[in-house]
């Protein structure tokens, strides 16, 4: 059980002198395991009893030990029930304190009532103030029960609870009708979840036989040990004034205990510290009793004397709890409490006895919780004991309990338990997790959740290629922080398993599933070069690049263009999804741009070396369009166009291009220059009689600007073939060549 | 690479305020427990604070109690220490400290930064 | 608070001695005691945790022992990197604390 104890100081003549403290001995610091453990939480738990509200009670933290609740104004304030939680994990426990009124109407005989399953429990409220009607009882706060105020016995009002299940477990109150709640009498029942004797799922396992009014827990078979006494049975009495799991906490003040209530873990409950009885814990004990609210007898023998706190002390050459047992009678010695195993090993045991005769190897034997009997394979014989060592076979999960390591000679015989944990080891329940990848390196998270038992000790990283049956690759790692495998090799797909490992021989787990993990493509070395471009138009750009010759084949998938725009911070990437293209074409460019230009090849998602920058300047865009083309035919070979000049022009216009097209054609237009921009009309010569063109033109200045209206005309006539269409303007007669 | 970087240390004047910063690389910031250390010119260490990895408990040294705050952004990967009311006696070299993940100790550590206060 | 003293404030040493330093805690720290060096103008590095345990990559030449309240931290034969100051530290309860420091400086 976790080692938590709650003091409830009940010096109640003035409650702002009054403190609940909560006490933590886990080891280390106490909350777990050291300063770093959850912290203890020491509240006030409002859910059924509640009180006025009042001024915030404080909490002062001693160190990571110990929490504090003070500030407690009226004696109202103190009524109710008051929580501890500490201990870490799948250990965190709380320890419940019940406070009742010392001026309430009913008062408890006894608060913490601890109930085996199939049980009666029987609560029973002593009248303090009489009043003439029903009592109440209710159970978590919810009606349970009524009484009229004839029935009480004694001045006592009982409430039998037959065959009580874990369920019936809380708090239960007994309240006069219409009086305050705060004058009732408050209850704890705990129902342990087996019978007398018995605790684990099944009830099935057999508890130690607690000592000194410990309670076995139901759950893993330990004994809760009373305030004042230690050991796996509670069978040592610590010094007077000390208290926890190891006797490691004393008693503030100098009246040591007097006047504290000690709450434990369940099953166990609250009581006085050893020595001490009474509602508020003040009555030390009558002589012949001792321990936790005096309830245990003394019945010393053979000249032993009482002792309130610790029981019988005997004279020299007696032992025992009642100081039966002579010297003579052999004694089990130094044997540890506790050890701890993991699953499937085949550990030695130790077990040394003392005596008169006496021990001899045959004489000692160890007994699993199964019952069965393990004779010691060797011993060593020493002039003040004897040890004996067990050769444990296979541990399963089963062995997990209380063993017995029992001597017996002529003299007597002596046995003490210890409990045994068997603990598995952990395995991983996910794969690791592939954070980043390179084509000869991977970085991988290998923290993941688990089964089994902690604390995780070692993680081991397992890799090797997939599909491979060379031998796996280890590293032992940090399970937070990333881990890069190195020395891969590329575009290869690796199998990556995760092994924990707890304390112990046996410790190592098995391997978590695997994972499939693959490298990056290799990284493409070549540097390609820009050989040259050329400007096709204000917005179109041929480039070509060339690559070194290198022995073998091409290391790449294709090549990435890009094109820096330095005034707008803009980048245009254009791939080229061949390795062996060594041209492109790039449209739709911004004119008048001056671009920053390189080429670099890719495999996979990586890119190789960028080619040494090259720095184009496209022309700025054209002209406006001209105005209001029209076409006239003049004869069955000539059509003549006329337009108006464009508007708002940047500049003057360098010359004017017609464009030439035979309706429905499926050939290649035909571009005529016509070198005299201040001309409004130009002649079309040698075309086809009786045939139907499209006309469009554009006037450029420094670059070629926006094209007209598209214009159809018919040459007349059915003449003979022309030889194509030429041009004449207006001021001259000189035809052009196509 | 595994690093802790510290920044925001400076000169301050007695009163004020600064928030020093450690930005995490190289490991899985929100499983660890992180720190601060401090270290006055030419003296020893001395454990200021510390965050479990939720943030959810955090633990102060008595001497900075009510003034210091600390506070972590799991998605930035980064640790804060906000320091307000600053003495003379605050002057040191602040270091972001790793907890291990065991819990055993400090395992990493930044390079620290400086903090005067001075008026 | 749980006061950590570390004793001798200075440790003058050759290469290749022997140098034991200690550590007492104002009451007990189980084992939960770690040992630190700080080199001039570096951060501190984790020499020893749980009073007797090497962290990842220190050498075997460092060694703790000890339990409770006194602690020893023991470099077997000093090479010319251990010049430096050695810190311990307690984490059994809160605040956590570091002793003053040894100093080891060549003789």
């Known amino acids: 059980a976790v080692d938590l104890t709650l003091l409830a100081n009940l010096r109640l003549t003035d409650p702002q002198r009054f403190f609940l403290t909560c006490v933590s001995g886990e080891a280390g610091a106490g909350r777990g395991s050291d300063a770093w453990g959850p912290p203890l939480l020491l509240e006030k738990d409002d859910r059924i009893v509640r009180t006025p509200p009042g001024p915030p009670l404080r909490l002062a933290r001693n160190g990571s030990h110990q929490v504090t609740l003070r500030g407690f104004s009226k004696p109202s304030d103190l009524v109710g029930v008051f929580s501890c939680v500490g201990g870490a994990g799948a250990r965190r426990t709380r320890v419940i304190y019940v406070h009742n009124s010392p001026g309430a109407h009913l008062l408890p005989d006894k608060v913490t009532h601890t109930v085996n399953k199939g049980d009666t429990a029987v609560l029973s409220a002593r009248v303090h103030k009489e009043k003439q009607t029903d009592v109440i009882w209710k159970s978590n706060g919810s009606y349970f029960y009524t009484l009229d105020w004839h029935e009480a016995q004694d001045g006592r009002f009982l409430l039998q609870l037959p065959n009580v299940q874990p369920p019936s477990s809380g708090i239960y109150s007994a309240t006069y009708l219409e009086a305050s709640p705060l004058g009732s009498a408050f209850f704890r029942l705990i129902v342990r979840g087996c019978g007398a004797g018995r605790w684990g799922p099944g009830c099935t396992k057999e508890c130690p036989g607690c000592l000194h009014g410990g309670v076995c827990h139901d759950h893993d078979g330990e004994c809760v040990c009373p305030p004042g006494f230690t050991g796996t049975r509670c069978e040592q009495a610590c010094r007077e004034g000390r208290f926890g799991q190891s006797c490691q906490e004393q008693c503030p003040g100098i009246s040591g205990c007097r006047g504290l209530t000690f709450c434990l873990p369940d099953p166990y409950g609250c009581s006085c510290g050893s020595g001490w009885r009474g509602s508020q814990c003040q009555e030390a004990c009558a002589p012949g009793h001792f321990g936790a609210d005096c309830r245990l007898q003394c019945q010393c023998q053979n000249g032993g004397t009482c002792d309130r706190f610790s029981g019988c002390v005997c004279p020299s050459g007696w032992h025992g709890v009642h100081c039966e047992k002579s010297d003579r009678i052999p004694q089990i010695l130094n044997m540890a409490s506790e050890l701890e195993f993991n699953l499937e090993t085949m550990p030695r045991i130790n077990c040394a006895a003392a005596g008169n005769p006496f021990p001899v190897r045959g004489s000692i034997e160890l007994r699993k919780p199964d019952g069965t009997v393990l004779l010691s394979t060797k011993a060593i014989v020493e002039p003040e004991k004897t040890t004996a060592e067990f050769e444990v076979p296979r541990l399963v999960l089963a062995d997990s309990g209380f063993w017995e390591c029992r001597v017996s000679t002529s003299g007597g015989q002596d046995s003490r338990r210890f409990k045994v944990n068997v603990k598995v080891p952990p395995v991983p329940l996910a794969a690791p997790r592939l954070l980043t990848k390179q084509s000869r390196q991977l970085v991988v998270s290998p923290l993941v959740s688990f089964s089994g038992d902690g604390p995780i000790s070692t993680v081991r990283l397992h890799y090797r290629p997939q599909d491979s049956t060379m031998d796996w690759s280890t590293i032992v790692v940090d399970p937070s922080e990333n881990v890069t495998l190195m020395n891969l090799r590329p575009k290869t797909g690796y199998s990556v398993r995760v092994q924990l490992s707890r304390p112990g021989e046996g410790g190592e787990g098995a391997w978590g599933p695997p994972t499939l993990m693959t490298t990056d493509c290799p990284e493409p070395l070549l540097q390609p070069w820009l050989e040259g471009w050329h400007v096709e138009g204000t917005d179109r750009l041929r480039v070509s690049w060339s690559l070194p010759l290198v022995p073998g084949p091409l290391v790449g998938d294709g090549f990435l263009l890009r094109l820096w725009d330095g005034t707008r911070g803009q980048e245009r990437r254009e791939n080229v999804s061949s390795p062996q293209a060594r041209t492109a074409l790039l449209t739709g460019l911004t004119p008048g741009t001056h671009y920053q230009l390189d080429v670099q090849l890719y495999h996979c998602t990586l890119l190789g070396p960028a080619s040494p920058p090259a720095h184009v300047l496209l022309p700025p865009s054209g002209p406006p369009a001209p105005r209001h083309l029209h076409a006239q035919a003049l004869s069955d070979s000539e059509i003549q166009l006329t337009w108006k000049h464009p508007e708002a022009l940047p500049g003057p216009i360098s010359k004017y291009v017609v464009e030439v097209q035979v309706a429905g054609g499926a050939g290649d237009p035909l571009w005529i220059d016509v070198d005299r921009p201040e001309e409004t009309s130009t002649i079309i010569r040698g075309l086809n009689a009786s045939t139907r063109y499209l006309f469009r033109m554009r006037a450029s200045i420094q670059g070629l600007g926006d094209w007209s209206n598209t214009v159809e005309e018919s040459t007349l006539g059915n003449g003979l073939q022309a030889e194509g269409p030429v041009q004449e303007s207006r001021a001259a007669e000189e035809g052009l060549d196509q | 690479e595994v690093q802790l970087l510290e920044s925001g240390g400076g000169l301050v004047q007695p009163g004020g305020s600064l928030r020093l910063s450690c930005a995490a690389s190289?490991?899985?910031?929100?499983?660890?427990?992180m720190n601060w250390v401090r270290q006055a010119p030419g003296k020893g260490l001395e454990w200021v604070s510390g965050i479990y990895s939720s943030g959810g408990y955090i633990y102060y040294a008595d001497s900075v109690k009510g003034r210091f705050t600390i506070s972590r952004d799991n998605s930035k990967n980064t640790l804060y220490l906000q320091m307000n009311s600053l003495r003379a006696e605050d002057t040191a070299t602040y270091y972001c400290?790793?907890?291990?993940?065991?819990?055993?100790?400090?395992?990493?550590w930044g390079q620290g930064t400086m903090v005067t206060v001075s008026s | 608070d749980i006061q950590m003293t570390q004793s001798p404030a200075t440790l003058s040493l050759s290469p290749g001695e022997r140098a034991t330093l200690s550590c007492r805690a104002s009451?007990?720290?189980?084992?939960?005691l770690a040992w630190y060096q700080q080199k001039p103008g570096q951060a501190p590095r984790l020499l020893i945790y749980d009073a007797s345990n090497r962290a990842t990559g220190i050498p075997a030449r460092f060694s703790g022992s000890g339990s409770g309240t006194d602690f020893t931290l023991t470099i077997s034969s000093l090479e010319p990197e251990d010049f430096a100051v050695y810190y311990c530290?307690?984490?059994?309860?809160?605040?956590?604390?570091f002793g003053g420091g040894t100093k080891v400086e060549i003789k």
């Open positions: 530290q307690q984490r059994s309860n809160w605040p956590l604390t």
């Open positions: 190289g490991f899985t910031f929100s499983a660890y427990v």
């Open positions: 400290a790793r907890r291990h993940f065991n819990g055993v100790g400090f395992d990493l």
């Open positions: 009451q007990s720290v189980s084992s939960y």
